[in-house]
Amino acid sequence: KFSKQSWGLENEALIVRCPRQGKSSYIVDWYYSQTNKSIPTQERNRVFASGQLLKFLPAEVADSGIYTCIVRSPTFNRTGYANVTIYKKQPDCNVPDYLMYSTVSGSEKNSKIYCPTIDLYNWTAPLEWFKNCQALQGSRYKAHKSFLVIDNVMTDDAGDYTCKFIHNENGANYSVTATRSFTVKDEQGFSRFPVIRAPAHNETKEVEIGENTNLTCSACFGKGAQFLATVQWQLNGNKITDFSEPRIQQEEGQNQSFSNGLACVNTVLRIADVKEEDLLLRYDCLALNLHGLRRHTIRLSRKNPIDHQSTYC
């Protein structure tokens, strides 16, 4: 229930967040799950705990394993597990699937590639970017904050992109790399006011308490490559990132598809272990481009309102 996979490469920094979140003021203790041995908080240690974060500076293959974090609230202690795997550096340029973060899609006019997990680190711009292990050079490539923008994207821009940055911890520098695939949709066309395909406006979706559910926000923006075409979820009018509930996550990046020649973008809101409170929230699917903003609202309702007992404990 409160477990998360994390991975990294040996001799690089890896920072992992406790899957069991709480208020920032809460003390968090970390342990090696197998030995129950406490992980130190002193920064002179190679592996040390810093609040909700567990830091491997740098990581070693032998660090692989399950780590327990205990969030100490004023009432009860709440436990989470981080499943960490550290891999040996690959001798060749190939990045195996198990080291890849989620794939992102782009087009001629929408080509942002975000650097995964970077928000956990203390880094300074600019990022270094590589495609299929070659450093990106030329004015087409612009490293902006935590993402890469490619001008005039072409189909052969598809490939594996690696961001490399330096994490600084008390004056010491550690390298971090993260790789994800980028796919390109190349087509000429037109742009129009967004049309939301899903959900229908004021739709109600039946869910089971205790189960997981996904909500898809899908909109079409015209034909061919689009400039500034984005879809996102909001909860009660707030950004997902402003809503501090780890069970509710919007998938990173957006998937672009072409339906009957139309350029459509979708993003999925994943709700784990649905709770009664989630039924009280308003879920807004927002579609935005240069023509304007369209919003469709969906609410959740209980599938079996009578004598429903969750089988999830």
């Epitope: 920032s24 004023p74 501090s244 009664e276 409170e277």
Partner: antibody, heavy 121, light 106 residues
Framework: QVQLQQSGAELVRPGASVTLSCKAS????????LHWVKQTPVHGLEWIGT????????VYNQKFKAKAILTADKSSSTAYMEFRSLTSEDSAVCYC??????????????WGQGTLVTVSA | QIVMTQTPAIMSASPGEKVTMTCSVS?????MHWYQQKSGTSPKRWIY???KLASGVPARFSGSGSGTSYSLTINNMEAEDAATYYC?????????FGAGTKLELK
């Protein structure tokens, strides 16, 4: 929707004990800590303590450690508070309550209707 | 235990008036919750995590503060806002409440 249904008013003699109940519905009972709060005109709102219905673990306000016992019955999704050795000082409205999202301790979002306890000879 | 001091204990305001009540804390806390209670009813969560409005709370309400000083403000007092407001800390056990500020309609 989330509901906390409390038992009815109690008139009890000094020195006696009373057990108040709080039946939870509309959510998974074992997913949330349940708290008890006492309200009097003199002392206002006072937190008595909390129980984790999943494990039965409890945390008490030291002031009420000898006064209250919190229990929970998973099978009926009901929490109980036994109030012992009652004096006139214990006359109060007692509420059961819980947070909106458990891990974030984001305030008592759901309250029972309250049970009036009157201690009188 | 953390002691919460609410001021004023009682206040009155006319419709349209700006109202501010404060909650002072004996030792620093990270967040503050506020509840509204009307006579004969259970308290309602009104503002949580210092500044977030609970569901259904009008936008004329706001909360602010840090450390040992927090406040609740109503920008344009309305008749329905007449009630008692309590602050509460969830920083350390035991959880504690303020004695309340009773807001009356002038």
């Amino acid at each position: 929707q989330v509901q906390l249904q409390q038992s009815g008013a109690e008139l009890v003699r000094p020195g006696a004990s009373v057990t108040l109940s709080c039946k939870a519905s509309g959510y998974t009972f074992t997913d949330y800590e349940l708290h008890w709060v006492k309200q009097t005109p003199v002392h206002g709102l006072e937190w008595i303590g909390t129980i984790d219905p999943e494990t039965g673990d409890t945390v008490y306000n030291q002031k009420f450690k000898a006064k209250a016992i919190l229990t929970a019955d998973k099978s009926s999704s009901t929490a109980y508070m036994e109030f012992r050795s009652l004096t006139s000082e214990d006359s109060a409205v007692c509420y059961c309550t819980r947070a909106f999202y458990n891990d974030y301790d984001d305030g008592f979002a759901y309250w029972g209707q309250g049970t009036l306890v009157t201690v009188s000879a | 235990q953390i002691v919460m001091t609410q001021t004023p204990a009682i206040m009155s305001a006319s419709p349209g008036e700006k109202v501010t009540m404060t909650c002072s804390v004996s030792s620093s806390v990270s967040y503050m919750h506020w509840y509204q209670q009307k006579s004969g009813t259970s308290p309602k969560r009104w503002i949580y995590d210092t500044s977030k409005l609970a569901s259904g709370v009008p936008a004329r309400f706001s909360g602010s503060g840090s450390g040992t000083s927090y406040s609740l403000t109503i920008n344009n007092m309305e008749a329905e806002d007449a009630a008692t407001y309590y602050c509460q800390q969830w920083n350390s056990s035991p959880l504690t409440f303020g004695a309340g500020t009773k807001l009356e309609l002038k």
